[in-house]
Interface confidence: medium
């Protein structure tokens, strides 16, 4: 459907993408599935996260963020081996301020790149970007005070992941507009990984029968569970390593008894 | 506000040609896909054809393909629909659209087309 | 090719809930979209993305799709309600159009 960004580039800025595909914008496609994919952002110039529908959508799509800076920022690999100095602000600190698409009225708060701040902004009930939290104190802990930590920058303490309006989860009723809402996920203190790997096995909403792993996160392992192929929520790997590879780098061990809390 | 007006109806020929447009404003125009759809006195809506994104992907319904050519100026904010080897079964009000992600979210309100002996 | 079907006609007494039906195959993997068309007029969208209602549009319209069939539900229905409804998916990288259904208010 977005072909490519439809804009000169005096007005993106001088880089030029390495393909002609990173300059498309970033395409969901019209089906209902819930992909945790990246796309090449021709205005920030940085690889940025959405969410996929599993049928159509274009070439701007990577399974990982690594894959699509590979592909799509000049010279990434060159710099790729940065200083492990102090933490990064993950790529969604910098977006801009995105009401989204609804007309609901969510208090929520943004990092605001100019002034180095977390700020207080109206949120419509759907669509946007991540630069979007629920609570002052978790902005400032994700994008004004990153802490260090040995899992890949974008991946720290991500509060429960904003949905893009397309994801069929439950729904509510913000101002008279039905509005899909990301599923609850409790928070826990004892893990500090993916958000989503604390979220229930869903098998969707669709009719298939596809062996799938979920991170149970009582047990820290792996489970099978049948997926129906739509819907459903990101705990929801093809393969248990995978599963295990996403999700048990977030346990943190007590260190005094060298138990898992 | 937006707004989508159609012009280049009317009566032609079996055979004939004819070409549609459809002025554009209150958008920004080359931002979006654009569609053709079309309806038979008395009928349903049937999609015609798309214009995608800055390289002008085009599409088509199997029933106009070969014949009908949709076309943008985005310099002057127009969509247009040549129509060629017209036949009576094209006879419709066709309206063009703004495709906004999957769906139409304003329409223009129409121009008749008869193809007539 | 894919065919999303209708019911050619659903009458309501004023007041009451209509529903309208649209079935095909893609639906259980696909959004449907649904849009009403007043005689001379042309087409509006109620809904969006299955359950989506655009600003504007009455709170009485609501959507739902579950299985092979999305469904347009017009609670406590009105007069001027009475309209063709449409519902539309996409196949194939093109959209598609339901045949439409007319939505006759009783009395």
């Known amino acids: 459907l977005s072909e490519e960004a439809d804009d000169t580039d005096s007005e993106l800025g001088s880089m030029k993408p390495l393909h002609t595909f990173c300059a498309m914008k970033a395409d969901d496609g019209p089906c209902k599935a819930m992909i945790r994919s990246y796309f090449f952002n021709m205005y920030t110039h940085q690889c940025e996260e959405f969410i996929y529908g599993g049928c159509e959508g274009n070439e701007n799509r990577f399974d990982t963020l690594e894959e699509c800076k590979k592909t799509c920022i000049p010279g990434y690999e060159k710099t790729a081996v940065k200083a492990a100095s102090g933490a990064e602000r993950p790529d969604f600190c910098f977006l801009e301020e995105d009401p989204g698409l609804c007309r609901g009225y969510m208090k929520r708060y943004l990092y605001n790149n100019q002034t180095k701040q977390c700020e207080r902004f109206v949120y419509g009930g759907c669509l946007g970007n991540r630069n979007n939290f629920e609570t002052l104190d978790e902005c400032k802990k994700i994008c004004e005070n990153p802490v260090h930590s040995p899992s890949p920058v974008n991946e720290v303490q991500m509060s429960d992941y904003v949905t893009d309006g397309n994801t069929v989860t439950d729904r509510s009723t913000v101002n008279n507009i039905v509005v899909p809402q990301s599923p609850k996920v409790p928070r826990r203190r004892d893990y500090r990984g993916r958000p989503w790997c604390l979220q229930p096995a869903d098998s969707g909403l669709c009719k298939a029968s596809e062996r799938r792993f979920y991170y149970n996160s009582a047990t820290g392992k792996c489970h099978r569970f049948n997926y129906t192929g739509c819907g459903g929520n990101n705990n929801n790997f093809t393969t248990r390593r995978r599963c295990l590879r996403s999700c048990k780098t977030g346990l943190i061990k007590n260190k005094s008894k060298g138990v898992v809390k | 506000q937006v707004q989508l007006v159609e012009s280049g109806g009317g009566l032609v020929q079996p055979g004939g040609s004819l070409r549609l447009s459809c002025a554009a404003s209150g958008f920004t125009f080359r931002s979006y896909g654009m569609d053709w759809v079309r309806q038979a006195p008395g009928k349903g809506l049937e999609w015609v054809s798309s214009?995608?994104?800055?390289?002008?992907?085009?599409y088509y319904a199997d029933s106009v393909k070969g014949r009908f050519t949709i076309s943008r100026d985005n310099s002057k904010n127009t969509l247009y629909l040549q129509m060629n080897s017209l036949r009576a079964e094209d006879t419709a009000v066709y309206y063009c659209?703004?495709?906004?992600?999957?769906?139409?979210?304003?329409w223009g309100q129409g121009t008749l087309v008869t193809v007539s002996s | 090719d894919i065919e999303l079907t209708q019911p050619p006609s659903v009458s309501v007494a004023p007041g009451q809930t209509a529903r309208i039906s649209c079935s095909g195959d893609n639906l259980p993997n696909y959004y449907a979209h649904w849009y009403q068309q007043k005689p001379g007029q042309a087409p509006v969208v109620v809904i969006f993305y299955d359950v989506n209602r655009p600003s504007g549009i009455p709170e009485r319209f609501s959507g739902s799709n579950s299985g092979n069939t999305a469904t347009l539900t017009i609670s406590g229905t009105q007069a001027e309600d009475e309209a063709d409804y449409y519902c539309?998916?996409?196949?194939?990288?093109?959209?598609?159009f339901g045949g439409g259904t007319k939505l006759t208010v009783l009395g």
């Open positions: 659209a703004r495709l906004y992600r999957y769906w139409f979210d304003y």
């Open positions: 539309q998916s996409w196949w194939d990288g093109v959209p598609v």
């Open positions: 214009i995608r994104g800055s390289r002008s992907s085009t």
